[in-house]
């Protein structure tokens, strides 16, 4: 057992038919000596007198909150949630597993630049009942400070017959050295309470991994005299990091025509313009990536050719 | 060039090669996220490799103040990488295959370190730890995980030298 | 020792125009962009316009675009703000702000390193 907070304790059990359970002593957080009553959650019902009560914990039913009495009077609570162990893992029942970029895969993590700040989110089918408290460190064996706002819904989507919620975090490093080369990972780890269950989840990773630039801005085109083609310009993204001339983008431009099918002309290029050939009905497409570092891509900034 | 007594390397040279080995590093090791290296118990490989640390002034400010630093660095960390890939991780068994651009990057690594250090100036160098793992596989993981680490340091010297060139170039 | 000053500011009629400076001293623009931010009294200090003078990239807050330009002399070491077809709401001290290495010319305040002690603005007729 240990604490996950103030008067809030999780117990580590054993999930398998007949465990024997995790046998727990909780002391009434009071100088009273006696006339000390126990009870849990809502119900009436006294479980034992004392200082301290001894339970065995063994199911959900086990969990809750404790409290001891003195002649009517609450003296003190302790909350007890289980961490369940299946087979030696821990059970991952709160969030939903992303798949991407590999299995178990619950945390994902982006950042639009090098400035150590980033944003992790994750799913669920839970709607109700449900906490989730972060922290992050780089490194953890002499962690270095990164600072993680609170966990908020961030989307709702219907997925068949299911509702899915999507929570995400914002965390910033806050000694950030984005012209260094990161030797030490870093760590988020997200606690999940649904209803008396607790679980954790974690993510390791350096900033150069999970670096995706937002979209190239202001993409033009510009036809050229007496031909089919056209200039296309683009601008950097406001978010990505500068100056641009350390912290470089290479971009691929694309024609796309109307059906999926037809052929795509792809242009990679350091440069913000690029010449192509406009099609009729097509689209042409730019994104971004860093110059020196192959992390994700941006999304696509379209515009059409006509 | 950027020697000992402080004049300036080619800058130009130096940004064309180093984004050179950026690709030539990705295409040694283009597997991004599919193998996440970390789990595979780092300690005793990758944290002996010189990394491009925050006081080593490889950044805009640093580099405008004093390049020498930064470059020392960087001459450090190709040398000791250049001596990796000449290494029997690379050279043992299983063997490379005849067009894998290891090879490229391991001679572009030199082309870099001599272009910043010419004959006859020498900086220290960082020792080389004795990484010798008996079995293939091993030996298979440890190319990984080296190569991952190269990616990460030649992209920040990339950098280095695309800043340079745009604004400390004569 | 690292410095930057706003000139510039001052009283204008609404539609009028202003041109803000910032000079900059103790580094280099090529190595740093530069963000402008403005708060009016009793309101939050907001971001106006950014640049990174190495390639000229600039940013604009949706309330200025079209109206304000940023650009700079790297000769002079100099960011400048053209305000043209100010509006009363556009009063409020500017400030010129170097921003951190590594993060974008959109970047907060809290991005900043070093900070001008402003100019006053005031749109009135």
């Known amino acids: 057992i240990w604490e996950l907070k103030k008067d809030v304790y999780v117990v580590e059990l054993d999930w398998y038919p007949d465990a024997p359970g995790e046998m727990v002593v909780l002391t009434c957080d009071t100088p009273e000596e006696d006339g000390i009553t126990w009870t849990l959650d809502q119900s009436s019902e006294v479980l034992g007198s004392g200082k301290t009560l001894t339970i065995q914990v063994k199911e959900f039913g086990d969990a809750g909150q404790y409290t001891c009495h003195k002649g009517g009077e609450v003296l003190s609570h302790s909350l007890l949630l289980l961490h369940k162990k299946e087979d030696g893992i821990w059970s991952t029942d709160i969030l939903k597993d992303q798949k991407e970029p590999k299995n178990k895969t619950f945390l994902r993590c982006e950042a639009k630049n090098y400035s150590g700040r980033f944003t992790c989110w994750w799913l669920t089918t839970i709607s109700t009942d449900l906490t989730f408290s972060v922290k992050s460190s780089r490194g953890s064996s002499d962690p270095q400070g990164v600072t993680c706002g609170a966990a908020t819904l961030s989307a709702e989507r219907v997925r068949g017959d299911n509702k899915e919620y999507e929570y995400s975090v914002e965390c910033q490093e806050d000694s950030a050295c984005p012209a260094a080369e990161e030797s030490l990972p870093i760590e988020v780890m997200v606690d999940a309470v649904h209803k008396l269950k607790y679980e954790n989840y974690t993510s390791s990773f350096f900033i150069r991994d999970i670096i995706k630039p937002d979209p190239p801005k202001n993409l033009q085109l510009k036809p050229l005299k007496n031909s089919r083609q056209v200039e296309v310009s683009w601008e950097y993204p406001d978010t990505w990091s500068t100056p641009h001339s350390y912290f470089s983008l290479t971009f691929c431009v694309q024609v796309q025509g109307k059906s999926k099918r037809e052929k795509k002309d792809r242009v990679f290029t350091d440069k913000t313009s690029a010449t192509v050939i406009c099609r009729k009905n097509a689209s042409i497409s730019v994104r971004a990536q860093d110059r020196y570092y192959s992390s994700s891509w941006s999304e696509w900034a379209s515009v059409p050719c006509s | 060039r950027a020697v000992p007594g402080g004049s300036s390397p080619a800058w130009t040279q130096c940004q064309q090669l180093s984004q050179k080995l950026c690709t030539l590093a990705w295409s040694a090791h283009p597997l991004v996220g599919h193998m996440d290296l970390r789990e595979e118990g780092d300690e005793e490989t990758t944290n002996d490799v010189p990394h491009i640390q925050c006081g080593d002034g490889c950044d805009p400010q640093g580099l405008r103040d004093n390049s020498q630093f930064c470059l020392q660095r960087i001459h450090q960390g190709l040398i000791f990488y250049e001596k990796l890939l000449g290494s029997d991780i690379f050279t043992g068994e299983p063997s490379l295959l005849p067009d894998s651009p290891v090879g490229q990057l391991h001679a572009s690594l030199l082309g870099l370190s001599q272009l910043l250090q010419p004959e006859g100036h020498h900086w220290e160098t960082q020792q080389i730890p004795s990484l010798s793992p008996s079995q293939p596989w091993q030996r298979l993981l440890l190319r990984f995980k080296i190569l991952r680490s190269l990616q990460a340091f030649v992209a920040v010297a990339a950098r280095v030298f695309a800043h340079g060139a745009a604004t400390l170039s004569p | 020792e690292v410095q930057l000053v706003e000139s510039g500011g001052g009283l204008v009629q609404p539609g009028g125009s202003l041109r803000l400076s910032c000079a900059a001293s103790?580094?280099?623009?090529?190595?740093?962009?530069i963000a402008w931010f403005r708060q009016a009294p009793g309101k939050e200090r907001e971001g106006v316009s950014g640049i990174d003078s190495g390639d000229g990239s600039t940013y604009y807050a949706d309330s200025v675009k079209g109206r304000f330009t940023i650009s700079s002399d790297n000769a002079k070491n100099t960011v400048y703000l053209q305000m043209n077809s100010l509006r009363p709401e556009d009063t409020a001290v500017y400030y010129c702000a170097r921003v951190r290495t590594g993060w974008g010319l959109n970047a907060p305040d809290y991005a900043m390193d070093y900070w001008g002690k402003g100019t006053l603005v005031t749109v009135s007729s």
């Open positions: 103790g580094f280099y623009l090529d190595d740093y962009a």
